[in-house]
């Protein structure tokens, strides 16, 4: 379809790099999550940090380019880095409106399907570019 | 300062390709925004051909899909456009533009192509 | 394709007038409240020049005579007080959906 992806937008404060400039941003009033229009794909990510207690919001927007996992019409996040001890770092892409305001599920840390121990280990800075 | 410069031959012969370069100065390609190519007919209006972001992803316009090509050469800072299987209809000012977010802030100053055996 | 229709195709105009120009897409141009619809002047032998962006922002450089309003299908482009130096071409431009349109063009012309 000719309709251009909106995807959530939000980087968590601390964050480096930007993903801003692969969309347009929109003045979507105080009632709807801040909203990113995509330019290079149709196509929204997520990247949330779940830890023992919690999953944190680190990253949403949009994605510079369609690749698989884009055609989901659900945020189904994927393990992808150990950004520290006791914290993994999840991925989603999907493709509708809005698709990556929240996720469907986490696995709880440490069950089968989640990176162990001696997953990936980034260094501070670097862990949202390897999730991506 | 961000200059864009179109190149490339001036008469191109029914039933050929028309290849045409953009050199961008002042700026990497590779590091943001859409590169794209514009065209239009002598006293006539403006369409836009299709674009090639900075990560290489491409969009076309469906009237021209299947004769365009979009690419780039990162080493000579340049991107390029081939239109296959020309027509008269084909004749215009193509213009090479970086668009940031989807309007066309930067243009270069434009080539004639005429088409014509 | 959304097609964009401008009024009028030429207009005569005086240094000093008050020139509108109007744009009409064939569908709406806008994203959740936000109006994808631009503006260009064009020169002869000229590329085009970027005047207004998202319907009423003013690109840097711009002269304030010049202005944007519209949302939906219908936009307007108005120069409060005509310049010698705006006699020229104007084109809007959509980017709501791929691919990008512009509109036929207006030209300005000395009265």
């Known amino acids: 379809p000719p309709n251009r992806r909106t995807c959530v937008f939000f980087e968590a404060p601390g964050v480096q790099g930007s993903t801003k400039t692969l969309g347009e941003l929109l003045d979507t009033g105080p009632e709807l999550p801040r909203a990113i229009r995509c330019l290079y794909s149709r196509c929204c990510f997520g990247i949330w940090n779940l830890t023992q207690d919690r999953a944190q919001v680190e990253m949403q927007g949009c994605r510079d380019s369609d690749e698989p996992g884009c055609e989901s019409l659900h945020c189904d996040p994927s393990p992808r880095a150990h950004p520290s001890p006791g914290s993994t770092l999840f991925t989603c892409s999907c493709g509708t409106d809005f698709c990556n305001a929240n996720y469907s599920h986490l696995p709880p840390p440490g069950s089968p399907g989640t990176p162990g121990s001696q997953g990936p280990q980034a260094a501070p800075g670097e862990s949202i570019w390897m999730a991506l | 300062q961000l200059q864009l410069q179109e190149s490339g031959p001036g008469l191109v012969k029914p039933s050929e390709t028309l290849s045409l370069t953009c050199t961008v100065s002042?700026?990497?390609?590779?590091?943001?925004?859409?590169w794209n190519w514009i065209r239009q007919p002598p006293g006539k209006g403006l369409e836009w051909i299709g674009y090639?972001?900075?990560?290489?992803?491409?969009s076309y316009n469906p009237s021209l899909k299947s004769r365009v090509t979009i690419s780039v050469d990162t080493s000579k800072n340049q991107f390029s456009l081939k239109l296959s299987s020309v027509t008269a209809a084909d004749t215009a000012v193509y213009y090479c533009?970086?668009?940031?977010?989807?309007?066309?802030?930067?243009w270069g100053q434009g080539t004639l192509v005429t088409v014509s055996s | 394709d959304i097609q964009m229709t401008q009024s009028p195709s030429s207009l005569s105009a005086s240094v000093g007038d008050r020139v509108t120009i109007t744009c009409r897409a064939s569908?709406?141009?806008?994203?959740?409240?936000?109006?994808?619809m631009h503006w260009y002047q064009q020169k002869p032998g000229k590329a085009p020049k970027l005047l207004i962006y998202?319907?009423?922002n003013l690109e840097s450089g711009v002269p304030s005579r010049f202005s944007g309003s519209g949302s939906g299908t219908d936009f307007t482009l108005t120069i409060s007080s005509l310049q010698p130096e705006d006699f020229a071409t104007y084109y809007c431009?959509?980017?709501?959906?791929?691919?990008?349109?512009f509109g036929g063009g207006t030209k300005v012309e000395i009265k």
């Open positions: 569908e709406s141009v806008d994203t959740y409240g936000n109006s994808f």
């Open positions: 431009q959509q980017s709501n959906e791929d691919p990008y349109t």
């Open positions: 533009a970086r668009s940031r977010y989807s309007w066309f802030a930067y």
């Open positions: 090639i972001s900075f990560s290489g992803s491409t």
């Open positions: 002042g700026y990497s390609i590779t590091s943001d925004f859409a």
């Open positions: 998202r319907a009423s």
